[in-house]
């Protein structure tokens, strides 16, 4: 997290806000509900209280405007700048302005007013932008899904550094951004994508370029807004410029940022039995056109060319790949070796000699 220079903050805990005008995109009650919910994000974790005024001067004046709207920080039409807010202080201090050239919504369409407002009110309270891609105060808008919003830990630390904790946090689970060098790190899925490696963990993935050591961290939804926050497995089919992503009983085919029509599909359409609730890991072999799909202690082999499951499957993981354990969290193939991830450990397995040749920490893939 980051606070503004000179640690700008309010010297009182009871703050007022006023909605000066409304966007035509939403009903008045939807707008009021979004702002109320956005303030609650911050009051839940601090001693701050927010009271709405219907007229007069409030600490935080909220308005919608377009282009030049009276503060010498003009908006820019659709997209680009969405909103801005002033840090704590008199006059403009704390005020939040929303660009009415955007389409404001209470859903995933357009820009979600609650999410943008919660971010802007962070500024109104003294938080600057964060470098943590998982933080609400990260400067890039990402719709995080329909489920109950949980304020990330980075933002909690930031706001509590200014105002301290509240009496009781009604939602004490604050998601932490994974630390790539945590020795206990386990991974959810790994796939190549157009020459890069994508390493998925929780609602994030690291993007590793072959000539770089520093992996970039992204929210999965910043790349693919329509995908679930967390995924179970992934593999690339390079000759078709596609990757396949699995979550629960569904899977998606993606070309770059775009989901192919007809997806998601059910994993049972691949020929998996109905009892299989999820795929835990998947890896594709371009030379044979086969894909290994792992679930529980079993492995299936799918023929991507003929679109059928191979006979003689499923088989036990322990029998086909002795020594790697009876589950696979994530897997990828490179230069004749399969890398199996099981908890905080990865096994380098030689396809040629059919044996484990190295055991390494899982996060050595991230150069830790």
């Amino acid at each position: 997290y980051n606070v503004f220079p000179r640690t700008l903050k309010w010297s009182k805990m009871n703050l007022t806000y006023r909605i000066v005008n409304y966007t035509p995109d939403m009903t008045h009650s939807e707008v009021e509900k979004a702002f109320k919910k956005a303030f609650k994000v911050w009051s839940d974790v601090t001693p701050l209280n927010f009271t709405r005024l219907h007229d007069g001067i409030a600490d935080i004046m909220i308005s919608f405007g377009i282009k030049e709207h009276g503060d010498f920080y003009p908006f820019d039409g659709p997209s680009g700048l969405l909103a801005h807010a002033f840090p704590p202080g008199p006059n403009y201090g704390g005020d939040a302005h929303f660009d009415d050239d955007e389409t404001w919504t209470s859903s995933s369409k357009g820009y979600n007013l609650f999410l943008v407002a919660a971010h802007e009110f962070g500024h109104s309270l003294g938080l600057d932008h964060s470098k943590d891609p998982g933080a609400l105060m990260f400067p890039i808008y990402t719709y995080t899904g329909k489920s109950h919003f949980m304020l990330p830990d980075d933002d909690v630390q930031g706001i509590q550094s200014l105002y301290g904790p509240g009496d009781e946090d009604p939602n004490p689970k604050h998601p932490k951004t994974p630390d790539k060098c945590d020795p206990s790190l386990s991974l959810d899925a790994i796939t190549s994508l157009r020459g890069e490696t994508m390493i998925f963990k929780d609602r994030f993935f690291w993007r590793l370029h072959p000539q770089q050591v520093d992996a970039e961290l992204f929210l999965t939804k910043s790349f693919w807004p329509e995908l679930p926050n967390r995924i179970d497995a992934a593999y690339e089919h390079p000759s078709h410029d596609l990757i396949f992503i699995f979550r629960g009983r569904k899977f998606w085919a993606l070309n770059g940022y775009d989901i192919l029509e007809g997806y998601p599909k059910k994993i049972s359409e691949l020929g998996l039995p109905k009892e299989v609730k999820k795929i835990s890991a998947a890896v594709h072999f371009e030379d044979t056109g086969k894909t290994l799909l792992f679930s529980g202690n079993q492995v299936w082999r799918y023929d991507d060319t003929n679109h059928i499951m191979d006979k003689d499957y499923p088989r036990l993981i322990e029998e086909d790949f002795p020594g790697i354990g009876d589950k696979v969290d994530a897997v990828y193939e490179k230069n004749g070796y399969i890398y199996f991830f099981n908890g905080p450990i990865q096994f380098e397995y030689s396809i040629w000699s059919n044996r484990i040749v190295r055991v390494m920490p899982a996060n050595s893939i991230l150069w830790c």
Epitope: I140, F218, S222, D241, N255, G256, Y257, D258, L260
Partner: nanobody, 114 residues
Framework: KVQLVESGGGSVQAGGSLRLSCAAS????????MNWYRQAPGKQREFVAG???????NYAVSVKGRFTISRDNAEGTGYLQMNSLKPEDTAVYYC????????WGLGTQVTVSS
């Protein structure tokens, strides 16, 4: 429906630069990814660069660090700035909106001579 028209192709010496433009007509351009693909004679069409609706970029390994993709949603235009061009960059470059099942331009020829 989106229609795409590429421009900016041409001939250039190795080490030179070109800037390709992709003009889109149709209001849904801003809601789709924007990508550049290329096809060299006798080869398959290959991905070059992509930019999401949220302006996150993705590059083929062979062009990363040399090419830069950008978009201007208000103008309905996408760009590919190509620097340090190599003879192997010679191809017809296609603009794409929305991925493989999306919309395609007719292409613009880029020729890089040594």
């Amino acid at each position: 429906k989106v229609q795409l028209v590429e421009s900016g192709g041409g001939s250039v010496q190795a080490g030179g630069s070109l800037r390709l433009s992709c003009a889109a007509s149709g209001s849904t351009f801003s809601r789709r990814s924007m990508n550049w693909y290329r096809q060299a004679p006798g080869k398959q069409r290959e991905f070059v660069a992509g930019i999401s609706t949220g302006r996150i970029t993705n590059y083929a390994v062979s062009v990363k660090g040399r090419f830069t993709i950008s978009r201007d949603n208000a103008e309905g235009t996408g760009y590919l700035q190509m620097n340090s061009l190599k003879p192997e960059d010679t191809a017809v470059y296609y603009c794409n909106a929305g991925g493989l099942q999306g919309y395609w331009g007719l292409g613009t020829q880029v020729t890089v001579s040594s």
